[in-house]
Structures are given as C-alpha cells and as structure tokens.
Amino acid sequence: GSVPPMVNVTRSEASEGNITVTCRASSFYPRNITLTWRQDGVSLSHDTQQWGDVLPDGNGTYQTWVATRICQGEEQRFTCYMEHSGNHSTHPVPSGNSHHHHHHHH
C-alpha cells in the first residue's frame, strides 16, 4: 500500500526584500512524488525552483523538498503542490510569525 506524505512549508529571510519558501514532504511511500511551487495557480518553471533528492528517511519511507525565492509580501500568491499515488494537496505559505504548516494527506 501507499503511505501519504507529511507536508511542511517554511519561510526564511533571503536577501533584502526576498524570502525563501521551502516545502518538505516526508514519511511517504512509494518514492514517486511530485512536489512543486505554484504561483497564482500555475506551476513555476523548473529553473526558478531547487529540488532535493528523494531520500530514504530510515523508516522504509522517503523524504524530499523543493524551494524557491519570492518577493516579500507576495507569499499568498504561492502554494506548494504535492501529488502522490493519485492524490494531491496544496499548501500555502504561513504568515510571518508562524513558521510551519503540517498536513498529513489522507
């Protein structure tokens, strides 16, 4: 069977006026997954995103991440899109003071 991922979105200061938003998926099986940032509903081009390898996390499941740099104040236009085993979910960027968004996709 499949194990759905936990998805966690974080933000960190990058350069002046920019932030880096990172979307991490963990504890999923099988290893096939789509993880990408979307702006205004549409997937960003590959060259504006950085991906981590899909790696075993020691429990027979896998983990990976995707990050992109965006203008501060435009966070709400972005969502992390996750697709795994025929299911999808979307994950917005938390507001400034809160640094994570956990979602276990069913």
Epitope: S43, F78, E83, H88, P92, S95
Partner: antibody, heavy 117, light 107 residues
Amino acid sequence: QVQLQQSGAELVRPGTSVKVSCKASGYAFTNYLIEWVKQRPGQGLEWIGAINPGSGATNYNEKFKDKARLTADKSSNTAYLQFSSLTSDDSAVYFCARFLGNYFDNWGQGATLTVSS
Amino acid sequence: DIQMTQSPASLSASVGETVTITCRASGNIHSYLAWYQQKQGKSPQLLVYYAETLADGVPSRFSGRGSGTQYSLKINSLQPEDFGSYFCQQFWTTPYTFGGGTKVEIK
C-alpha cells in the same frame, strides 16, 4: 474570458448514479485545479474536492470520499463529478470553480440535482 | 476541520448605510480568506481574497480586513444592487470551509 459551463438540471431516482459536467474555456485547462462545491438550501456551501485536470490527481473532502468521484477529460476541457447510490441528501446545487492559487476566481453557473422517487 | 462562524445570519439596512459582516475561524488561517456575494439562483462571485484584496471589477465601497482568526467585510454606502447573500471561505487547509452566510436585505 474564463468560463465554466455546467450541465443542466437532473431529476434522478434514489439509488442510481449521475454525472455532472463542467466545460472550461478561455484558459489553459490543464494548468489549474478544478474544485467542486455543494450547496443545499439553508445548509450553506460545502467543499467536495478538487482535481488536477493535467494529471487526474484528486483531493477529496473525507465526507464525500465514498460518494463522489472526480474525473477530467483533457481532450474536451471538461471536468466531471459523479455520484453513486444517490439519496435525497444529495439533492443540491453543485458548482465547479477554478482554483487560482489560494481562492476560487471563477465559478460555473451551477447544476441542480434532484433525487426523488 | 476549521470551522468558520459568520455573523450576523441576516441583516436589513437602508441604502447609504454602512454594514459589517464578520467571520471567525476556529484556528489561525493566516489571512487565507475570501468573501463572495451570491444572488438568488446564481453562482457566488468573488469580492475579496487574501482577506483584503479586492477582486477585479469590485466597487471600492467593499473592503475586507482581518488576520489570525478574525475577519470582516465592510460595505460602505450600501447600494440597491448589494442585496443578496455573502459568504466567507478559508483556504488555509483542506477541507476548505465556508461561513454559514449572511443575507443582506435592503430596507
């Protein structure tokens, strides 16, 4: 301009199935998620689920997981909502909508479903 | 699931008056809130998104505000065409949930 054109009203018997359609035009159909919403008189609005028309991947409200099935046909730019084992509780207006990042920017006109013997 | 509590359920106001509708979320929704207007027999129309951004073509007499768990929609100088029902919806997490609605009647 962006348009979502839904199929017409349906009168169906309890226990049967029905398929509601939502034809998109004016934009790249496979680029945006399509959402489905249920509205019953006096009961407000309920999110049923969403489909990625490009891949067919779905996201269901747990409440509707065993009742609704979402599909999409890329060749005709049409999304579908199928219901099985219909009961009177399924009588409602069903809307499709486009997901523009983090809100629904365009809605279909609604399809009225009446389940009655 | 995040519950959205909207108030009042209905209101009656005169043309030119200012009215305010509120929505309270059961958890922090980080300003991922939209407001819709719906006329009888029609589909909802987007008014405000991200809690305070006006959708294209929406008159400036409408304004949204709020953060965390508390949000409001204000209509300045109510016009006859503003009658109908208003709904809030949160987009922080699925299932996306709606407020119960506010029916606005013109006196």
